[in-house]
Interface confidence: low
């Protein structure tokens, strides 16, 4: 003989995969104080409970350890706690109170649990800016994870030199010492919920500040193709009267400030061009000598020089033979 009672609250609850949900249940007010029994949560259509406080009763293998009956008859509590929710927990459940000694039991109304795909993603936080050669602590956190669930497994993926720092149930710290070549590369934090077999990840692009490592000069002579100088050069022969375009480029992040100087400049020298481009429309005696491109950056500067050697056209020289 069964007596029915209504579960308070909603008829259905939603939980995301891997997370937790509490199915509320209050024992019927008509329950006699002397009623002694065990509580069982069942899946609709199943005869093996998913959770119980009956020590002699087996529970479903797949829910064992994840589904818990929060049993407190004094407070009339018969709620069901579900952790590490899995897609396959998607079902209707009901609570049954059975007495070993009395002829009748109590059966609750049904409540549906809907398990949805996990939409939350980990957060990656970076304190300030990442600077080449300087260690920084990155934190991957999953603040939406419930404490009672199986702790997630954190995995980090990065090409940069790293070491693992401390971790909690909800976060993991990675110490990264980036190099210039790590700028714009991907760093991924992957979080796996072993209880539900769900993995989520977030990927960010590293923004690494670094001083210029390479500076180069491209030389355009008239309409001819450019050629590139990657190191200081003693002399570059050019014809008198020829148009010359010198283009300087450098790496570095944020981009270095490029400027051109004639000669080998002192630190406070005045540039002849405040960009990476130096136009020499007609090379003459004034242009013979050294030109320096300087790449200035808050984290360090770099410069490269080339020396122009002017070839004179025979008919162009006064007193020419």
């Amino acid at each position: 003989q069964e007596r029915r009672f209504q579960l308070e609250g909603p008829e259905s609850l939603t939980v995301q995969e891997g997370l937790c949900v509490l199915v509320p249940c209050r024992l019927p007010t008509t329950l006699p104080a002397s009623y002694y029994g065990y509580g069982y949560w069942f899946l609709e259509g199943a005869d093996v409970p998913v959770a119980t406080n009956d020590p002699d009763e087996e529970v479903q293998e797949e829910t064992r350890g994840r589904f818990h009956l929060l049993w407190d008859p004094r407070r009339k509590n018969c709620s069901l706690s579900i952790r590490d929710a899995r897609r396959r927990d998607n079902a209707a459940y009901f609570f049954r109170l059975k007495s070993k000694w009395m002829k009748y039991g109590y059966t609750s109304s049904k409540l549906s649990v809907r398990v949805m795909a996990l939409t939350h993603r980990p957060n990656i936080s970076i304190p300030g800016t990442l600077e080449s050669g300087h260690p920084s602590n990155l934190t991957c956190s999953v603040p939406w994870v419930c404490e009672q669930g199986t702790p997630p497994i954190f995995s980090w993926m990065s090409a940069a030199p790293t070491s693992l720092g401390p971790r909690t149930t909800q976060s993991s710290v990675l110490t990264i010492t980036p190099r210039p070549q790590d700028h714009s590369t991907n760093l991924t934090c992957q979080v796996t919920f072993p209880g539900a077999g769900v993995t989520m990840e977030r990927t960010i692009q590293l923004n690494v500040s670094y001083a210029p490592q390479k500076v180069a000069i491209s030389i355009f002579q008239g309409n001819s193709a450019a050629f590139k100088i990657l190191q200081n050069t003693s002399s570059l022969p050019v014809l008198e009267g020829q148009a010359l375009r010198l283009l300087c480029d450098a790496d570095g992040n944020p981009p270095a400030h490029l400027s051109w100087f004639q000669g080998f400049p002192a630190l406070n020298a005045t540039p002849i061009s405040n960009t990476g481009v130096l136009e020499l429309p007609q090379v003459g005696s004034a242009e013979e000598g050294d030109f320096t491109c300087r790449a200035q950056h808050p984290l360090g500067s770099l410069q490269i020089s080339l020396s122009l050697f002017v070839h004179w056209k025979p008919e162009g020289r006064a007193g020419g033979v």
């Epitope: 829910t63 209707a92 398990v115």
Partner: antibody, heavy 122, light 106 residues
Framework: EVQLQQSGTVLARPGASVKMSCKTS????????MHWVKQRPGQGLEWIGT????????TYNQKFKGKAKLTAVTSASTAYMEVSSLTNEDSAVYYC???????????????WGQGTSVTVSS | QIVLSQSPAILSASPGEKVTMTCRAS?????IHWYQQKPGSSPKPWIY???NLASGVPARFSGSGSGTSYSLTISRVEAEDAATYYC?????????FGAGTKLELK
């Protein structure tokens, strides 16, 4: 008595699609996962995917994603599978099968349809 | 995915003989199910959750195993047992079946 009645033999051309049905009776259709299994002539069993008619939640074997589509009409207690872009490799018997319990798969696939035979030929 | 390897592929036995077929998993599984299939028929649930006989299955059948190694044993084979037996797991997605062991009677 639980019964799963599948639609009849199908002969189809390459490139076509077929939709087969699995009509159920004798139990609460919306409370159990329905699985589909493929068996090529003289071969073993291959799991295609499963659908929970209670909310149409479905999950597929990666191999059959885009090839098979599972649906369910609760008012008719009937599950459907559509197989598209047919090739000779799709010639097989397709079974629908009920899973014994929703949560644990503890009882395995406890009821099976009689199978729908699909032959792909030009 | 977890691969289930069944051996032997073909098992030939005389009536009254004891036979054992095995199912090995490429990774540990919590339990497996066994199905019996006869030519022209659907598979039937035979043993569920490693060792529990499905409804109507004769008591001469038994199942055992754990981890990666499972087996189905028939204590005294009868003519009606001639069939192909498939093992199946669902400890990880996708569920997979073994290739089957065909039991023939001499």
């Amino acid at each position: 008595e639980v019964q799963l009645q599948q639609s009849g033999t199908v002969l189809a051309r390459p490139g076509a699609s077929v939709k087969m049905s699995c009509k159920t009776s004798g139990y609460t259709f919306t409370s159990y996962w329905m699985h589909w299994v493929k068996q090529r002539p003289g071969q073993g069993l291959e799991w295609i995917g499963t659908i929970y008619p209670g909310n149409s939640d479905s999950t597929y074997n990666q191999k059959f994603k885009g090839k098979a589509k599972l649906t369910a009409v609760t008012s008719a207690s009937t599950a459907y599978m559509e197989v598209s872009s047919l090739t000779n490799e799709d010639s097989a018997v397709y079974y629908c099968s009920r899973e014994g319990t929703v949560v644990a798969n503890y009882y395995g696939l406890d009821y099976w349809g009689q199978g729908t035979s699909v032959t792909v030929s030009s | 995915q977890i691969v289930l390897s069944q051996s032997p592929a073909i098992l030939s036995a005389s009536p009254g003989e004891k036979v054992t077929m095995t199912c090995r998993a490429s990774s540990s599984v919590s339990y497996i199910h066994w199905y019996q299939q006869k030519p022209g028929s659907s598979p039937k649930p035979w043993i569920y959750a490693t060792s529990n006989l499905a409804s109507g299955v004769p008591a001469r059948f038994s199942g055992s195993g754990s981890g990666t190694s499972y087996s189905l044993t028939i204590s005294r084979v009868e003519a009606e047992d001639a069939a192909t037996y498939y093992c199946q797991q669902w400890s990880s997605k996708p569920p997979t079946f073994g290739a089957g062991t065909k039991l023939e009677l001499k």
